[in-house]
């Protein structure tokens, strides 16, 4: 179904537990690695293992793991050795929550609330630092001012607007509207003292299968800076999109399954049936991405108990333009992605 | 209804650049792309470029490679294109129109008022 | 030239059926791609007529019907009205090595006689 998860990929068996604190060894040294490297599951980042000797398929959520076989450090995983006491010798991939962050050499722990410097606050929330600027220019350049500019004023935090024409001024000024004033901003715009903001939201956290993509915003009732999260499924993993490529075409752009689906999470079910567009996939170098989408909300029945909704990311048509050296490492190519904004809301 | 509102008439010099606008209504660029077509005067259709959803990629006609961008702006939900290096044969009206971002889709289904571009000496 | 081939025009008295074929090559219409007609009025934008092939979108009057064989297509027009009297343009896909094309007939100059 459209929002299931990604199979795991390797699992371990642990040894019975026993009464006893002997760990097993998981590295070797020297390191034997194999020849070539495995090839992993499209989605399932290739990594270094934890002995810093092979390459390996990253341990995905739930996945067992060792200090050999580590979890995807991509997704935010972590080794939970919390059911193998007194050993920790084998966990089980779980989900970091409320990670702290560090800005600039210097960590904050999560929720926690700072200031950098006089002109931010900042908010530390699962790893991300969303800040709200401290100084709200009262007073933007007027029309008539063809070049403004902000500058230091001694003694004073909050740098103030010049305007280096003013002799030219004319007898009637008119101020900016400060809400055309901050709508040039990418996605700012002024109300009661507060310029919201909202990040773009990170890329989906797999290349197939469930996922999960998140944002800052402080557009709510306290201006307060606040992540939020969508679930995201660029492509199934378990539909080969390259047999669908139209002959004498490189690239299927977007896959969309004949059959409209319900979508699943947790065991529970999707009230509504959807068809979904995906991403598709390129016989060259090139990575389709999300280019044309949006956040809908999707509510879901669950057999026992109440149900919930979850925002879901749905895509619209995806872009096939970027280079891509490794599938497995979806963060591999984020340095070198052009200035393309993904069009989204 | 969709509607397609096009910047209005350019008279430019041969060698320069134009930019023709088109804003959309009733609908939202995150649901479609917008094409761009010209017509001579007196002559056919010519289609120039626009965003092609099976390919993922933005396409341009052969005649108009290296010469024409096309750019779109969701937060306006308007489109544009620029023409560079023009020449007389340029003289044209351009047209914006719609393609329903669907597998299979390849046709127009709305069209702009068109914008007359005029190349002088 | 066009990639795709129409006659330059077309005529036919009030009340009678006139059809504009659209022929081309098997990198466009005999490769599967749809054909499209689009009606010019003299001065204005063109419009969609038929999309897919056979399809009419809403308002368009039944009097317009298309048809897709191989390589080529054709539009009839029954019982020809004075307002008929426009240019129409067939229109495909065309996927070929050099890259992916929305490509036009030349036009066809339908006169009502």
């Known amino acids: 179904t459209a929002l299931s998860p990604t199979p795991t990929t390797m699992t371990f068996t642990p040894a019975p537990l026993e009464e006893t604190t002997t760990r097993p060894e998981f590295c070797k040294w020297p390191c034997e690695c194999p020849q070539s490297p495995p090839r992993c599951p499209l989605g399932v980042s290739l990594i270094t293992d934890g002995c810093e000797c092979c390459k390996i398929c990253a341990q995905q959520l739930g996945d067992n793991c060792t200090e050999a076989a580590i979890c995807d450090p991509h997704r935010g995983l972590y080794c939970d050795y919390s059911g193998d006491r007194p050993r920790y010798a084998i966990g089980v991939c779980a989900q970091v929550v409320g990670v702290g962050c560090v800005l600039d050499g210097v960590r904050y722990t999560n929720g926690e609330s700072f200031q950098p410097n006089c002109r931010y606050n900042c908010t530390c929330i699962d790893g991300t630092v969303g800040c709200t600027p401290l100084c709200l220019s009262p007073r933007p350049p007027r029309l008539w001012c063809r070049q403004p500019r902000h500058v230091r004023v001694p003694g004073q935090c909050c740098e103030q607007w010049v305007c280096d024409d003013d002799a030219r001024r004319p007898r009637q000024t008119a101020l900016l509207d400060t809400r055309a004033f901050a709508a040039s901003g990418a996605v700012e715009q002024r109300y009661e003292n507060c310029i919201a903001y909202t990040s773009p939201w990170s890329p989906c956290s797999t290349t197939c299968g469930l996922g999960i993509s998140t944002r800052i915003s402080n557009v709510n009732a306290r201006c307060w800076p606040e992540q939020e999260s969508r679930l995201c499924n660029l492509r199934p993993c378990d539909v080969d999109i390259q047999l669908h490529i139209k002959a004498g075409k490189k690239c299927l752009a977007v896959y969309q399954p004949e059959e409209a689906t319900n979508f699943t999470l947790a065991g529970c079910v999707s009230t509504r049936t959807y068809r979904p567009k995906y991403c598709g996939v390129c016989t060259d170098n090139r990575c389709c991405i999300p280019y044309k989408s949006k956040t809908i909300s999707v509510d879901f029945q669950c057999p026992e108990g109440p149900g919930f909704s979850r925002q879901v990311l749905w895509i619209n048509a995806c872009f096939c333009n970027l280079s891509c050296r490794n599938p497995n490492d979806i963060f591999a190519d984020l340095e070198s992605y052009p200035d393309f904004e993904e069009i989204a809301n | 209804e969709v509607q397609l509102v096009q910047s209005g008439a350019e008279v430019k010099r041969s060698g320069a650049s134009v930019k023709v606008s088109c804003k959309l209504s009733g609908d939202t660029l995150t649901d479609l792309s917008i094409h761009w077509v010209r017509q001579a005067p007196g002559k056919g259709l010519e289609w120039m470029g626009g965003f092609d959803f099976e390919d993922g990629e933005i396409v341009y006609g052969d005649k108009f490679k290296g010469r024409v961008t096309v750019t779109e702006d969701p937060s306006t939900d308007t489109a544009y294109m620029d023409l560079k290096r023009l020449t007389f044969e340029d003289t044209a009206i351009y047209y914006c129109a719609t393609i329903k971002d669907i597998p299979g889709r390849y046709y127009f289904d709305f069209w702009g008022q068109g914008t007359l571009v005029t190349v002088s000496s | 030239q066009s990639v795709v081939t129409q006659p330059p025009s077309v005529s036919g008295a009030p009340g009678q059926r006139v059809t504009i074929s659209c022929t081309g090559s098997s990198s466009n219409i005999g490769a599967g791609y749809d054909v499209h007609w689009y009606q010019q009025l003299p001065g204005t934008a063109p419009k969609l007529l038929i999309y897919?092939?056979?399809n009419r979108p809403s308002g368009v009057p039944d009097r317009f019907s298309g048809s897709k064989s191989g390589t080529s297509a054709s539009l009839a027009i029954t019982g020809l009205q004075a307002e008929d009297e426009a240019d129409y343009y067939c229109?495909?896909?065309?996927?070929?090595?050099?890259?992916?094309?929305?490509?036009f007939g030349g036009g066809t100059k339908l006169t009502v006689l």
């Open positions: 229109q495909s896909y065309d996927s070929s090595l050099s890259g992916s094309n929305w490509v």
């Open positions: 897919g092939n056979s």
